[in-house]
């Protein structure tokens, strides 16, 4: 999906008012310095691409993030503010239903959510120069 035509300010507002705290709660008990940010993004569409990938695509050691509250809210926000997003995701969801995983919090998942927090922070500050 091409995130170029999303309403970025509305997504930012959704993140600040309904998503960010759930990421913090997921990470509770973890030191903010525990994980290094290794995933970066260069502009808002790119940030959303990376956010979508880290949130919804199962990875080795962390297969269950897509079932977390912050993931559901992300999915809902993208569906509303990214034209055509919901249509492109319907087929993907049917495939995902067949391999539904139970929610497990592993160290790998914590690292992944830490990366997500970094991506969202970057998304919210698009005018900052890339480090």
């Amino acid at each position: 999906y091409d995130f170029t035509n999303c309403d970025f300010e509305k997504i930012k507002a959704a993140y600040l008012s309904t998503i960010s705290k759930d990421l913090i709660t997921y990470m509770s008990g973890t030191k903010s310095t525990e994980f290094n940010n290794t995933v970066s993004c260069s502009n808002r569409p790119h940030c959303l691409t990376e956010i979508q990938s880290l949130t919804f695509n199962p990875t080795a050691g962390c297969a269950s993030l897509a079932k977390e509250m912050f993931a559901m809210k992300t999915k809902a926000a993208l569906a509303i503010w990214c034209p055509g997003y919901s249509e492109t995701q319907i087929n993907a969801t049917q495939a995902m239903k067949k391999r539904r995983k139970r929610k497990v919090t592993t160290n790998k998942c914590l690292e992944q959510v830490s990366q997500l927090q970094g991506l969202w922070r970057r998304f919210n500050r698009p005018l900052l120069k890339q480090q």
Epitope: A14, L16, S17, T18, I19, K21, D22, I24, T25, S28, K67, E68, M69, M72, K73, K75, A76, A77, A79, I80, Y85, S86, E87, Q89, I90, T93, Q94, K97, K103
Partner: antibody, heavy 116, light 108 residues
Framework: QVQLVESGGLVQPGGSLRLSCAAS????????MSWVRQAPGKGLEWVSG???????YYADSVKGRFTISRDNSKNTLYLQMNSLRAEDTAVYYC???????????WGQGTLVTVSS | DIELTQPPSVSVAPGQTARISCGGD??????VYWYQQKPGQAPVLVIY???KRPSGIPERFSGSNSGNTATLTISGTQAEDEADYYC???????????FGGGTKLTVL
């Protein structure tokens, strides 16, 4: 303007009923939609919700008896209610659940009475 | 699912400040929403994301949330604010929406 209009009715205990909710004024197919009920003189109780892609969630009190569905081409939300009990008597609200976690638009509500 | 606890009733004199509490385990780690419901009407969202007001909601409505308690504050309460108020959050395990039992606000 944004509008949700429900239809309901009277049914006997053990019977079935399907509620409908016609949505207008917004891109229905993009939104997570839900049903909330309110028994006479009681508080609000969330019943069920459904994503644009058909992913569903249910309150424990209705799991296995109620089925939520939607027809995005008709901008309509449904609630199929089976094995109805007297305690299911309530006003049922169709609701647009913003960002999966709160309700920003409510229908006017429809009274479902389960009585013999 | 988590349980949200509200006082059944709160009374306030016109022009005074009304505070309605909503208690729940680690509630500060989740977002809280508040709805106003007048007799025979559907609920109306008055606070979202703990403390934000939807457009059209008067400035006298405000919200806060920390620890195990969220609070809806109505400053300079008016007669028209008399209604039932419900807090709402969600369960992080089931992902279901959860409502408090509701508080009847009486403006004396």
């Amino acid at each position: 303007q944004v509008q949700l209009v429900e239809s309901g009715g009277l049914v006997q205990p053990g019977g079935s009923l399907r509620l409908s909710c016609a949505a207008s004024g917004f891109t229905f197919s993009s939104y997570y939609m839900s049903w909330v009920r309110q028994a006479p003189g009681k508080g609000l109780e969330w019943v069920s919700g459904i994503f644009f892609d058909g992913t569903t969630y249910y309150a424990d009190s209705v799991k296995g008896r109620f089925t939520i569905s939607r027809d995005n081409s008709k901008n309509t939300l449904y609630l199929q209610m089976n094995s109805l009990r007297a305690e299911d008597t309530a006003v049922y609200y169709c609701a647009r659940q913003q960002y999966f976690d709160h309700i920003d638009i409510w229908g006017q509500g429809t009274l479902v009475t389960v009585s013999s | 699912d988590i349980e949200l606890t509200q006082p059944p009733s709160v009374s306030v004199a016109p022009g005074q400040t009304a505070r309605i509490s909503c208690g729940g385990d680690s509630l500060g780690g989740k977002y809280v929403y508040w709805y106003q419901q007048k007799p025979g009407q559907a609920p109306v969202l008055v606070i979202y994301g703990d403390s934000k007001r939807p457009s059209g909601i008067p400035e006298r409505f405000s919200g806060s949330n920390s620890g195990n308690t969220a609070t809806l504050t109505i400053s300079g309460t008016q007669a028209e604010d008399e209604a039932d108020y419900y807090c709402q959050s969600y369960d992080l395990k089931s992902l279901n929406v959860v409502f408090g039992g509701g508080t009847k606000l009486t403006v004396l």
